[in-house]
């Protein structure tokens, strides 16, 4: 991969600070889940957002950490162990499993920086991979051979 | 949302440069799609990664931009218009549609920075939202009312 040159911000601009400020804006899914009028249930709706029309329906759970960038992440949580029948959208079909799709997302944690003599010099960013569940997917169960 | 203090890197450390270097490492899905021995097809496998066992199977397409962070993004591409039958794993079931799940991801583009008199001062980062398709999901078609 190419290596970018060092970023040279214009006068008075702290690029790291800009990154921090930009990244604190949460980015929910394009089609956000509306609050259910009924309790969350194992059924596939015929309207509404993708996560409620899916035959492997899921809800989103907010994961907020003020010491992390992004501060807000959303984790998918499956509402059914199996898939919902395409015939009715209501009962479960155990021929399919509802499985979480995971992704390792790059996040940054703030940690104290130390100067030459170990003095506290503000905060630095530490990059980590963070496992996020993106969605629930209806899959055929694995055949153990 | 809380506002973090300005990042104070230790001597000789350019935090923006660090962010750039860290972010150029692509982060594929946890369970990467192995190259198929057979041509990509509209069927749900009983083994292999999640995207090939799904009844809304998909492949990943690399989107590389050396002027963007992250440089490598992966887009899901559905292999079937409908869902695959849970009974056989090969026939399509028109009662379900295979739909892309989208997400607006924060990315950073490098652009030239300009000094006080408009002189070129290296590169700055510009934050943008970038639409990425994460997966294909089997859904019940919308009922038009």
């Amino acid at each position: 991969y190419s290596h970018w040159p060092s970023c040279c911000p214009s006068k008075g601009q702290d690029t790291s600070e800009e990154l921090l400020r930009w990244s604190t804006v949460p980015v929910p899914p394009l089609e956000p889940a509306r609050p259910n009028r009924h309790p969350e249930s194992c059924r596939a709706s015929e309207d509404g957002p993708l996560n409620s029309r899916a035959i492997s329906p899921w809800r989103y759970e907010l994961d907020r950490d003020l010491n992390r960038l992004p501060q807000d992440l959303y984790h998918a949580r499956c509402l059914c162990p199996h898939c919902v029948s395409l015939q009715t959208g209501s009962h479960m079909d155990p021929r399919g499993n509802s499985e979480l799709l995971y992704h390792n997302q790059t996040v940054f944690y703030r940690r104290p920086c130390h100067g030459e003599k170990g003095t506290h010099k503000g905060y630095c960013l530490e990059r980590r991979l963070y496992r996020v569940s993106l969605a629930c997917v209806c899959v055929r169960p694995r055949v153990m051979g | 949302y809380s506002h973090w203090p300005s990042c104070c890197p230790s001597k000789g450390q350019d935090t923006s440069e660090e962010l750039l270097r860290w972010s150029t490492v692509p982060v594929p899905p946890l369970e990467p799609a192995r190259p198929n021995r057979h041509p990509e097809s509209c069927r749900a496998s009983e083994d292999g990664p999640l995207n090939s066992r799904a009844i809304s199977p998909w492949r990943y397409e690399l989107d590389r931009d050396l002027n963007r962070l992250p440089q490598d993004l992966y887009h899901a591409r559905c292999l079937c218009p409908h869902c695959v039958s849970l009974q056989t794993g090969s026939h399509m079931d028109p009662r379900g549609n295979s739909e892309l799940l989208y997400h607006n991801q924060t990315v950073f583009y490098r652009r030239p920075c300009h000094g006080e008199k408009g002189t070129h001062k290296g590169y700055c980062l510009e934050r943008r939202l970038y639409r990425v398709s994460l997966a294909c999901v089997c859904v019940r078609p919308r009922v038009m009312g």
Epitope: L86, Q87, H91, M92 | H91
Partner: antibody, heavy 123, light 113 residues
Amino acid sequence: QLQLQESGPGLVRPSETLSLTCSVSSGSIRSSNYYWGWIRQPPGKGLEWIGNIYYSGNTFYNPSLKGRVTISVDTSKNQFSLKLSSVTATDTAVYYCARQGYSDYELNWFDPWGQGTLVTVSS
Amino acid sequence: DIVMTQSPDSLVLSLGERATFNCKSSQSVLDSSNNKNYLAWYQQKPGQPPKLLIYWASTRESGVPDRFSGSGSGTDFSLTISSLQAEDVALYYCQQFYNSPWTFGQGTKVEIK
């Protein structure tokens, strides 16, 4: 053999709630091989499916009835019930209860049917 | 929703004649994974509830006389009475159970000349 019998008031006022019960005899409502349904037939017209219930309480309804329908089950009495709210004259019909087969994780045909009960919506 | 359309609306025939009526669905009710057509036929005599005659488009329910037969696949189906009897005077409905909501045709009325 299994029999179904509908019961409830024959006259309901507009805007009120229609309530009917279906009693199942010579068979258990707790069978895992069946769903239980309601179908109606306006005078001189065709059949319209209203909704279904499983003994565990899982329900699904005809979207055309716009959330006015509630079906419940009482396994101790071997009965299931229909409630249709905010009725109008267009809800006047013979209401049938029926058993619907359930096998290979799919629902199929209705058999048998109850005799039906005429419900008139009028003030 | 799947729309079921029956034709003709009524049929007036003599005893012993062959009666054929049709049912068309707005989309296929054939499941290619099991090669089954999710269609049933019912008979409704005056003042009585509907009675199941045929399921899976062509399988006769036990106790139904063999003069009744069903055929067709995909979107086009028919019910045939090979030799019309007086007790066959009734309304005949087709119904799909491929996808909820379950829907019925408007019915075909069979009468004797």
